[in-house]
């Protein structure tokens, strides 16, 4: 199904405008900001979601050590350019002609430059590390139960194939979820780990992107799991290119 037929809404993306003007009077939904048609049976790409967010009213808004090449999204929100498939274009520029290269999750991976900056290809983010700290509880969660619950969540809520959840680490109060998805592993129809991570991030912040679906209520054997901070690290198939001055 492309959208909920009975009341013509998009279950997987509330930032859409839907109408029964598809083939045969079918419900068709378009993303705010870009006007691109979206498939409401799966997650919408992060690029289209960011674009929609920027067009919306402003108020609508053993542990692994990340490698030296891991990126954190320090730049925050921007109005991205998306390709016809809804993916980030490799080169992004702002209104003042400042340009930079991004990876497949839209995070900057080069220094900023001018309009002459070249970004030859969209580099794939193949490994995402989601680092969470949960609020204090009476005791630690059972690791196996926590692990299974988070894997279930990514399967059921985000439709991410279980093979892409590489590991769940837990050292109270820190939880780390590792998502891995190489270009060769991703088949047609598979949810992208970057999109799943973005939906999860928004859910954790209480800003669910789902339509008519309750907010995220994470429980482990009935015990609420409340997250107090989230950090997401992105690792690309090709390491980022920053000059030394950025590191000082």
């Amino acid at each position: 199904h492309t959208a909920a037929q009975d009341n013509c809404t998009c279950p997987t993306n509330k930032m859409t405008v839907c109408s029964p003007d598809g083939p045969g009077g079918r419900c068709q939904c378009r993303a705010l900001g870009s006007g691109m048609a979206v498939d409401c049976s799966t997650l919408t790409s992060k690029c289209l979601l960011l674009k929609a967010r920027m067009s919306a009213p402003k108020n609508a808004r053993t542990l692994v050590r990340p490698s030296e090449h891991a990126l954190v999204d320090n730049d925050g929100l921007y109005d991205p350019d998306c390709d016809p498939e809804g993916r980030f274009k490799a080169r992004q520029c702002n209104q003042t002609s400042v340009c930079w290269c991004v990876n497949s999750v839209g995070v900057r991976r080069t220094d900023k430059g001018d309009l002459s900056l070249r970004c030859d290809e969209l580099v794939r983010t193949h490994h995402i590390l989601i680092d969470l700290r949960h609020r204090p509880t009476a005791g630690a969660f059972n690791h196996s139960d926590l692990d299974a619950e988070l894997r279930r969540l990514f399967r059921e809520r985000y439709r991410l194939h279980p093979k892409f959840v590489a590991a769940v680490h837990y050292e109270q109060p820190t939880i780390q979820i590792e998502l891995r998805q190489n270009t060769s592993q991703k088949a047609a129809g598979d949810v992208d780990i970057g999109d799943a991570a973005y939906y999860f991030e928004r859910d954790i912040k209480g800003e669910s992107l789902f339509q008519g679906r309750g907010g995220l209520d994470l429980r482990v054997r009935g015990e609420p799991l409340q997250v107090e901070r989230t950090l997401i690290y992105y690792l690309d198939e090709i390491p980022p290119k920053f000059s030394m001055k950025r590191l000082t």
């Epitope: 196996s144 194939h161 093979k163």
Partner: antibody
Framework: QVQLQQSGPELVKPGASVKMSCKAS????????IGWVKQRTGQGLEWIGE????????YYTEKFKGKATLTADTSSNTAYMQLSSLTSEDSAVYFC??????????WGQGTTLTVSS | QIVLTQSPAIMSASPGEKVTMTCSAS?????MYWYQQKPGSSPRLLIY???TLASGVPVRFSGSGSGTSYSLTISRMEAEDAATYYC?????????FGGGTKLEIK
């Protein structure tokens, strides 16, 4: 094509244990999840638990903690369920089923367990 | 845990007749799944994500609903549809099934 072949019927005495198998073919074993479901004669379906084959992560429903033990041998593409301290209440057909982005998309043919003295 | 209640428990229909069965959840679920089971066989996935037909399922089957109320409809009953139908949720652990609706042919 995807197939889940379960082991044959078992007749065991009360108090004993039994280990049944579910041999998978037609897909990459470690990419998926195997769930187990109980069905007593003339009754409905009852979920027991599941095992993530790539990581070995296991979840049991509260009722089957201590009763069922789920394991998998990735070298032979086989999932196992052991049931211990058997009573007549454990007499049932037990199904294994594959999980992906669906809870159960393919099912085995079932293993009939009879507990009788 | 989320309890799923199916009704009716048993029903019968004549060939060509429209059939509707329901599944009520004790608390809201995101999607409902439906399985068909014939005597001596294992269950078969019929409908996923509330309304999407699984591969090979005839178009006379349809599913609908949201929140706590879901239904399965067969537009025109056929003899081969005589079976027991189970609804199932996985919005939270433990996964649960409804008690089943046994559909007989008149």
């Amino acid at each position: 094509q995807v197939q889940l072949q379960q082991s044959g019927p078992e007749l065991v005495k009360p108090g004993a244990s039994v280990k049944m198998s579910c041999k998978a073919s037609g897909f990459t074993f470690t990419d998926y999840v195997i769930g187990w479901v109980k069905q007593r004669t003339g009754q409905g379906l009852e979920w027991i638990g599941e095992i993530y084959l790539g990581s070995g992560t296991i979840y049991y429903t509260e009722k089957f903690k201590g009763k069922a033990t789920l394991t998998a041998d990735t070298s032979s593409n086989t999932a196992y369920m052991q049931l211990s301290s058997l009573t007549s209440e454990d007499s049932a057909v037990y199904f294994c089923a594959r999980g992906s982005i669906f809870p159960f998309d393919y099912w085995g043919q079932g293993t009939t367990l009879t507990v009788s003295s | 845990q989320i309890v799923l209640t199916q009704s009716p428990a048993i029903m019968s229909a004549s060939p060509g007749e429209k059939v509707t069965m329901t599944c009520s959840a004790s608390s809201s679920v995101s999607y409902m799944y439906w399985y068909q089971q014939k005597p001596g066989s294992s269950p078969r996935l019929l409908i996923y994500d509330t309304s999407t037909l699984a591969s090979g399922v005839p178009v006379r089957f349809s599913g609908s609903g949201s929140g706590t109320s879901y239904s399965l409809t067969i537009s025109r009953m056929e003899a081969e549809d005589a079976a027991t139908y189970y609804c199932q949720q996985w919005s939270s652990y433990p996964y649960t099934f409804g008690g089943g609706t046994k559909l007989e042919i008149k």
